[in-house]
């Protein structure tokens, strides 16, 4: 959750955070859905992947995403040079060699093919939210979260603590 003044303080802090290991601490294959139980699906179109938010038909199989978890140092926001604990970051890969990326200029979420080590745009701070939901905050743009806008994934700025629990940035992870 972010206070308005906190967002500016964290802009440098999260960006400077360091992933403590090159290899993930664990991985998890899960389907991703919105707070309102719409599925996140991935479709190959013209040699590139598109991301959709849609209601699935009954018995239609959900797409899976591989979440790779990384432990990361959380820098102190006061000076920017101290360490203020640990946080969990994730990368999300729906298919081999493709990862979700934050495009901060376009405020969009895209699938990019890339090699490891992955760029910072592929890392998201994982927030453990109420009602068995999670949210994904951009490593490269603190205070900006993956959210749902017009049946697509987009980057949404959260400018106050109260807005962290708005439904459009809440997601559910499920093994089924």
């Amino acid at each position: 959750a972010f206070g308005i003044s906190g967002v500016q303080k964290y802009t440098r802090a999260l960006h400077d955070s360091s992933i403590t290991g090159i290899s993930p601490i664990t991985e998890y294959l899960a389907s991703l859905s919105t707070y309102n139980d719409q599925s996140i699906t991935f479709a190959l179109e013209d040699e590139s992947y598109e991301i959709y938010v849609e209601d699935l038909k009954k018995d239609e199989k959900k797409d899976k995403v591989l979440l790779s978890y990384y432990e990361s140092q959380h820098p102190s926001n006061e000076s920017g040079d101290g360490v203020d604990g640990k946080m969990l970051m994730v990368t999300l890969s729906p298919t081999k060699d493709f990862w979700l990326h934050a495009n901060n200029k376009e405020h969009s979420v895209e699938l990019h093919k890339c090699e490891k080590p992955l760029p910072d745009q592929a890392f998201f701070v994982l927030h453990n939210m109420h009602s068995n939901c999670v949210s994904f905050e951009c490593k490269t743009d603190p205070g900006v979260f993956i959210g749902v806008k017009d049946n697509h994934l987009a980057l949404i700025k959260v400018d106050s603590s109260e807005n962290l629990c708005t439904e459009n940035i809440l997601f559910k992870l499920s093994e089924t």
Epitope: A1, G3, I25, A30, H74
Partner: antibody, heavy 119, light 111 residues
Framework: EVQLVESGGGLVQPGGSLRLSCAAS????????MSWVRQAPGKGLEWVAT????????DYVDSVKGRFTISRDDSKNTLYLQMNSLRAEDTAVYYC????????????WGQGTLVTVSS | EIVLTQSPATLSLSPGERATLSCRAS??????????LNWFQQKPGQPPRLLIF???NRGSGIPARFSGSGSGTDFTLTISSLEPEDFAVYFC?????????FGQGTKVEIK
């Protein structure tokens, strides 16, 4: 330096009330989930209550529901625990704790304040 | 609620020895592919200190001699070579669901 300092503990009679405070410094208070955890003398740890960043959600252990209220004032960087209808079994050291960034575990603890409920 | 049972209640060891502490949960503490089991150290008159989070990850500033392992319902905290400052009480705790619960503790004492 990240710091949590509790205050407001003391001796109170059964049925009485007390308000604990926890002053936070060294971090952006509003960005973190905060909790109270207690420890009866010579006993183990018991989670009491949690409030999310943004004050949106609160959770309580069953034994204090309806008697205790957790709240926060982000403008004052302070966490509170209002304790009413106190019982002898509420006697404990009360610790203020901060979750890690992302809210996965209790990461920072205050030194605690002792609450004694006795006639 | 998830009940955590620690064993042994007391462990009597000498400095330099290896300590192995156990924590068993009444049901799985896995969520989102993570084992949400944490370990804390507490010395007399002090608050608990986070040692290990998510079963196997050291907290900030925690020495490498502390390690955690396990998944599902069975977890272990290992101190590879006990230092004099390691004699304390150790608690496991689950953060999978409310009510968050703690084990009753294991006291590591000097033999």
């Amino acid at each position: 330096e990240v710091q949590l300092v509790e205050s407001g503990g003391g001796l109170v009679q059964p049925g009485g009330s007390l308000r604990l405070s926890c002053a936070a410094s060294g971090f952006t208070f509003s960005s973190f989930s905060m909790s109270w955890v207690r420890q009866a003398p010579g006993k183990g740890l018991e989670w009491v209550a949690t409030i999310s960043g943004g004050k949106t959600f609160t959770d309580y252990v069953d034994s204090v529901k309806g008697r205790f209220t957790i709240s926060r004032d982000d403008s004052k960087n302070t966490l509170y625990l209002q304790m009413n209808s106190l019982r002898a079994e509420d006697t404990a050291v009360y610790y203020c704790t901060r979750a890690n960034y992302g809210n996965w575990f209790f990461e920072v603890w205050g030194q605690g304040t002792l609450v004694t409920v006795s006639s | 609620e998830i009940v955590l049972t620690q064993s042994p209640a007391t462990l009597s060891l000498s400095p330099g020895e290896r300590a192995t502490l156990s924590c068993r949960a009444s049901e799985s503490v896995a969520k989102y592919g993570l084992s949400l089991l944490n370990w804390f150290q507490q010395k007399p008159g002090q608050p608990p200190r986070l040692l290990i989070f998510a079963a196997s990850n050291r907290g900030s500033g925690i020495p490498a001699r502390f390690s955690g392992s396990g998944s599902g319902t069975d977890f272990t905290l290992t101190i590879s070579s006990l230092e004099p400052e390691d004699f304390a009480v150790y608690f496991c705790q689950q953060s999978k669901e409310v009510p968050f619960t703690f084990g009753q503790g294991t006291k590591v004492e000097i033999k």
